[in-house]
């Protein structure tokens, strides 16, 4: 990947799209498709204060935790959409982008340095454990990967490229 | 004991300019965002926009960005906010909030605007 | 921009409970805040991060938020509980939002 395409807000912008675009396929979370288990998600809400006082570093763990999870959750409802009867379609065509949406994520957060911090993250004992809930359906995995991209991610991103700026 | 105070209630007329303050106490002035809320009279709440100090970032809301500026001085923990071209519209009573991780957890007395001719 | 939508009014027999709602689009997707102002007095936080009491604040106070709603639960209701209640939260942008505000009356 391109040196620090991911400081593009346009490439950003263009996941966000297509993960916005995948729930809105998947016709509302109430009555869309279910998932045949529940799925653990990272939780995407943000105290914007909060965050923002976090340290970079600490805000790149958190990003990379978060990104891990999500990609295994995909992987997950992949699989499980792969063993039902009569997958849709247009649903199968959207879980595929979406893994390859957030492979491409994790190659350009690893050149901003994202992935160095996992590797000796600040005060390791003192981080706290990554916030999960789940998701029961197709709508609610998509949404959160949404929010995921729109809060957290691109938050980390305008800060860790506002620094490499520097 | 954290205390916010604001400067004292004008008067002014349409078109003249004004500065109110907001002088933060017992915590870390620069450790902590000013927010910026507006309440006309018989009205909700209208958050304005925050400031942190310490960087000095700025964001406005939409409804006010281009209206009035916020700043701050370090120096003496005070948070300004100011009109170049009041209006009657103008009206109101405006706080200022320490923003924390509890928003707006400690807020000023208020300051109370009236712009007539 | 964001929109949060309260009921104006909301009126509640002391002792009882009272529930003050604020609905924005995917609310649940983000922390909602509640705030208690009495006339002629600044604002007071009464919950944050959906649930939390800052101190000081009694256990009446709960707050929950999921979907498209948030709730402010005042159980145990008092004559003193009488005020506007606003909710509010942080976009992933970092706008603050008010939501439009609830009177809060205890009859009797």
């Known amino acids: 990947a391109p040196p620090r395409l991911i400081c593009d807000s346009r490439v950003l912008e263009r996941y966000i799209l297509e993960a916005k675009e995948a729930e809105n396929v998947t016709m509302g979370c109430a009555e869309g498709p279910r998932l045949s288990e529940n799925i653990t998600v990272p939780d995407t809400k943000v105290n914007f204060y909060a965050w923002k006082r976090m340290k970079v570093e600490e805000q790149a763990v958190e990003v990379w935790q978060g990104l891990s999870l999500l990609s295994e959750a995909i992987l997950q409802a992949q699989a499980l959409q792969a063993n039902s009867s009569q997958p849709p379609e247009s649903l199968q065509l959207h879980i595929d982008k979406a893994i390859s949406g957030l492979r491409s994520l994790t190659s350009l957060l690893r050149v901003l340095g994202a992935q160095k911090e996992l590797m000796s993250p600040p005060d390791a004992t003192q981080a706290a454990p990554l916030r999960t809930l789940t998701a029961d359906t197709f709508c609610k995995l998509f949404r959160v990967y949404s929010n995921f991209l729109r809060g957290k991610l691109k938050l980390y991103t305008g800060e860790a490229c506002r620094r490499g700026d520097r | 004991e954290v205390q916010l105070v604001q400067s004292g209630a004008e008067v002014k007329k349409p078109g003249e300019s004004l500065k109110i303050s907001c002088k933060g106490s017992?915590?870390?002035?620069?450790?902590?965002?000013i927010g910026w809320v507006r309440q006309m009279p018989g009205k909700g709440l209208e958050w304005m926009g925050w400031i942190d100090p310490y960087r000095s970032e700025i964001r406005y809301s939409p409804s006010f960005q281009g209206q009035v500026t916020i700043s701050a001085d370090k120096s003496i923990s005070t948070a300004y906010l100011q009109w170049s071209s009041l209006k009657a519209s103008d009206t109101a009573m405006y706080y200022c909030?320490?923003?924390?991780?509890?928003?707006?957890?400690?807020w000023g007395q208020g300051t109370l605007v009236t712009v007539s001719s | 921009s964001y929109v949060l939508t309260q009921p104006p009014s909301v009126s509640v027999a002391p002792g009882k409970t009272a529930r003050i709602t604020c609905s924005g689009d995917k609310l649940g997707d983000h922390y909602a805040y509640w705030y208690q102002q009495k006339p002629g007095q600044a604002p007071v936080l009464v919950i944050y991060?959906?649930?939390k009491r800052p101190s000081g604040i009694p256990e009446r106070f709960s707050g929950s938020n999921s979907g498209n709603t948030a709730t402010l639960t005042i159980s145990r209701v008092e004559a003193g509980d009488e005020a506007d209640y606003y909710c509010?939260?942080?976009?992933?942008?970092?706008?603050?939002?008010f939501g439009g505000g609830t009177k809060l009356t205890v009859l009797g």
């Open positions: 017992g915590y870390s002035f620069t450790s902590y965002w």
């Open positions: 991060d959906d649930s």
């Open positions: 909030a320490r923003v924390s991780s509890e928003p707006f957890d400690s």
């Open positions: 509010a939260t942080w976009t992933f942008e970092g706008d603050y939002v």
